[in-house]
């Protein structure tokens, strides 16, 4: 049962499995939910009646009845993880603490102009967990103004202090605020030779790469695949870190892979979430219990819906035992991985897909891609969203992207003559116009932010967003799409669609179903030589045939063009302007999401 | 067919730069991981820079370290070398190559002159 | 850093002949070796690695062997066309390392 709301004055006696400083009840919360075990936690507040050295302690805690025994204490704030729940959760913390002081280990001093510039650094710097900054009211004349960035083996501080006129916070890594470079290759035959900071047991190096990600002191890492010489060391995933933040030097071995963290582009790939199945292996851990189970299926469904449950493994039925059920042992560990993984008894083993909601909504996957047609089916493009005006009469105006739960990209040049955002109604999975119908359900626009260098779309800056007056919830039909990554500027898309409910040819009319085209994308030089008259600038992206055929058209501006890159769908492009339709040699101009990306969370995330 | 074809050598005085491009082309670029290696007049191979397909991560010999920078630009099939801070010592044909799985340079480009002389 | 000699520095043989090149690495680096070949004025072009594996390609008359810290590169019954400079690499770690050439010429 999820349980969301903090018990004040409370502590839960027991279960302790171990203690972090948290600045608030809240992060403590937070931290409680990304423990491998944690279920519950009793976090302590500032507070007169408390002995000051026991201040921000988060004491996280387990229990095999998922609940514990109460007892009243001033100060003492406790509460449940949000593991039993089903909402999206997040590890980004944007607050800022005044007069906290969180300690760590300070391994860099350098003087900032503010508190945001400092947490800034910290998330720009590939060691930094936190930060705390002294500010210009600071006593200590030398120290005024300084930004210490720290880190800890934990990713938590090691303890906090009150500190007048000092405020801190946490790297914005988690939030995919990081300009860091997002290394996503991975290396075979490939041993990074570095410290280890950890060792887990991995069923494969994407499994190894992702537990490196969300590892605090993780920046690559090294697995030994099961082909692995050293029988001993076989799946071992080994989490790696260096002063420089790189490999000091590769070495070659055969049956080994290395890579990096994905701290840096997080939001983009699923991190949290092992969804695969493992044939002929199985994870050893401490048995939680065995159930009967159709197939290995049920088995990961019952895993997923037994709160302590890490992983599991399933052990087919033996012909006709057991009415055609096999056992569904389901595991735990004090990590969250298995304890050795071991190959050739029958079994098949996976991972619980409770923790598939860390993971930004947008990396969830959706329906197939539909092969050939250009009509859609429901819910294969959810984020793609229709928007109406009602003045003079209602109509489909433009297309538009849900990017989060009270946000809508778009682009700006469907508002000329809209006065106020009280006209507009945004209609989210939706694949027939014809459903939409007095009493279909809309969201109502509180706010148009158009960007202010707007001009016209062939000029560029042809972005826009709508603020929703109420929150989407996120259904197969309706998901947000990821924004591109910054560190992805190099990445080269190969499947891209655009979708709208636009004109088919340049004289027509709004169609009823969604549309869908694949189209290639084009350099900015080959589109710039289509264009003679215009600049095509960096922040602009094209994509046609050169034949022409598949394009854009009147109706679908606004809407995404849709690039789908490590099986994760990005918004690249918001459909701008062209000449014509589908002509030969022009290819339809796009604004370049990427370029935008600042812009985008500067104005998503004000106050 | 791959094809690496370098250009932007040439003449430079000592404590010059030069930037090198090396224009790739018959492979999907981005899946490669790419070097630069020399080779100075009458003289043996010398490793001088590698860099990741994602572009993240690069790796230099010592004696081109906090001189040299390399980069590629996938969307163009392109990969660089920023060259500061020139020696006569760096005189030598700049061969562009392709860093296989096998740990070898699979395929190299025909090379371009830099002459590094007062 | 790991170092690599050849030798010898050069070997002169004739048409039909059978030759061999050695090379010893500083510390042992497995089987993890390539060969190169360098007509002159052309670029390298990669003959040999993982010590013994051809690249495709390559004619069968190119061998390797060894592994640890000693590699042979034998050419048998050499052809015109294999008169060049040959080279070996160790592919055990970064920083990478050549050895500085064997020239073969015809006799």
């Known amino acids: 049962e999820c349980v969301t709301q903090l018990l004040k004055d409370t502590c839960f006696e027991g279960g302790d499995i171990t203690t972090v400083f948290t600045p608030s009840a809240k992060y403590c919360q937070v931290v409680c939910t990304y423990h491998p075990r944690c279920l519950l936690f009793t976090f302590t507040a500032e507070s007169p009646s408390e002995d000051p050295t026991r201040w921000f302690t988060c004491v996280l805690k387990d229990s095999v009845t998922e609940t514990l025994p109460r007892v009243n204490r001033t100060a003492a704030i406790s509460g449940y993880s949000f593991k039993q729940c089903s909402h999206q959760i997040s590890a980004c913390n944007k607050d800022i603490y005044v007069d906290l002081d969180m300690k760590g280990i300070n391994y860099n001093s350098s003087v900032a102009k503010s508190a945001q510039e400092c947490q800034e650094r910290c998330t720009d710097d590939v060691h930094c967990h936190f930060f705390t900054y002294a500010t210009r009211q600071f006593p200590s004349l030398e120290h005024r103004n300084i930004c210490l960035l720290k880190h800890t083996q934990t990713g938590t501080p090691t303890r906090i202090t009150k500190l007048d006129k000092v405020v801190s916070g946490f790297s914005l890594k988690s939030c995919a605020l990081s300009n860091l470079a997002c290394i996503r290759d991975i290396f075979p035959n490939t041993v990074f030779a570095d410290s280890n900071i950890d060792s887990v047991m991995a069923p494969d190096a994407f499994v190894c790469g992702r537990i490196c990600t969300h590892h605090p002191g993780c920046l690559f890492f090294t697995f030994f695949s099961q082909e692995w010489p050293k029988e001993s060391q076989r799946n071992l995933c080994l989490l790696k870190t260096s002063e420089s933040g790189l490999p000091s030097t590769r070495i070659k071995k055969s049956k080994a892979l290395s890579g990096f963290s994905l701290q840096s582009c997080r939001h983009s790939i699923p991190v949290f979430c092992h969804s695969s199945f493992y044939h002929d292996t199985d994870f050893l851990g401490e048995e939680l219990d065995i159930v009967a189970a159709k197939s290995h299926e049920a088995c990961q469904k019952l895993c997923t819906n037994a709160v302590r449950c890490q992983f599991f493994t399933y052990t087919p039925a033996q012909a006709s035992c057991n009415e055609g059920k096999g056992k569904c042992y389901l595991k735990l560990s004090s990590n969250g991985s298995p304890t050795k993984i071991l190959h050739g008894r029958g079994g098949i083993s996976g991972y619980t897909l409770r923790l598939c909601k860390m993971d930004n909504e947008c990396t969830t996957k959706i329906k197939p891609r539909i092969v050939g047609g250009t009509a859609s089916v429901r819910g294969e493009w959810p984020w793609q969203v229709t928007l109406h005006t009602t003045s003079p009469t209602q109509r489909h105006l433009c297309g538009g992207s849900i990017i989060g739960n009270q946000w809508i990209l778009t682009a700006a040049h469907c508002f000329y003559g809209v006065e106020s955002p009280k006209i507009l109604r945004v209609y989210s999975g939706i694949l027939n116009q014809s459903e939409i119908k007095e009493d279909t359900s809309f969201f109502g626009v509180q706010e148009i932010i158009i960007h202010d260098q707007y001009k016209m779309a062939e000029s560029g800056y042809d972005i826009a967003l709508l603020k929703l007056e109420t929150t989407v919830n996120y259904t197969d039909s309706q998901r947000p799409i990821c924004l591109p990554s910054k560190g992805d500027r190099n990445v080269i898309y190969t499947d891209c669609w655009v979708t709208g409910w636009g004109y088919r040819k340049l004289r027509d009319k709004i169609q009823n179903t969604l549309q869908k085209a694949k189209i290639p994308l084009v350099t900015n030089e080959e589109c710039q030589k289509r264009y003679r008259g215009h600049k095509i600038t960096h922040k602009m992206i094209c994509a046609g045939y050169r034949e022409g055929g598949k394009d854009a058209c009147k109706g679908d501006s606004g809407g995404p063009l849709s690039c789908k890159h490590n099986e994760v769908w990005h918004l690249v492009g918001i459909t701008s302007w062209g000449e014509g339709c589908a002509q030969r040699e022009r290819p339809g101009v796009y604004t370049n999401v990427v370029e935008y990306v600042d812009w985008i969370l500067e104005k998503t995330q004000a106050v | 067919e791959v094809q690496l074809l370098e250009s932007g050598g040439g003449l430079v005085q000592p404590g010059g730069s030069l930037r090198l491009s090396c224009a790739a082309s018959?492979?999907?670029?981005?899946?490669?991981?790419m070097a630069w290696v020399r080779q100075a007049p009458g003289k043996g191979l010398e490793w001088v820079s590698s860099?990741?397909?994602?572009?993240?991560?690069?790796l230099y010999a010592d004696s081109v370290k906090g001189r040299f920078t390399i980069s590629r630009d996938n969307s163009k099939n392109t990969l660089y070398l920023q060259m500061n801070s020139l020696r006569a010592e760096d005189t030598a044909v700049y061969y562009c190559?392709?860093?296989?799985?096998?740990?070898?340079?699979?395929?190299w480009g025909q090379g371009t002159l830099v002459t590094v002389s007062s | 850093d790991i170092q690599m000699t050849q030798s010898p520095s050069s070997v002169s043989a004739s048409v039909g002949d059978r030759v061999t090149i050695t090379c010893r690495a500083s510390?042992?680096?497995?089987?993890?070796l390539a060969w190169y070949q360098q007509r002159p004025g052309k670029a390298p072009k990669l003959l040999i690695y993982?010590?013994?594996t051809l690249q495709s390609g390559v004619p069968s008359r190119f061998s390797g062997s060894g592994s640890g810290t000693d590699f042979t590169l034998t050419i048998n019954s050499l052809q015109p066309e294999d008169f060049a400079t040959y080279y070996c690499?160790?592919?055990?770690?970064?920083?990478?390392?050549f050895g500085q050439g064997t020239r073969l010429e015809i006799k």
């Open positions: 190559a392709t860093w296989g799985d096998s740990w070898g340079f699979d395929f």
């Open positions: 018959g492979f999907t670029f981005s899946d490669y991981e």
């Open positions: 860099i990741v397909p994602s572009g993240g991560w690069t």
């Open positions: 510390q042992g680096i497995s089987s993890w």
């Open positions: 993982d010590a013994s």
């Open positions: 690499q160790q592919a055990d770690s970064f920083p990478i390392a």
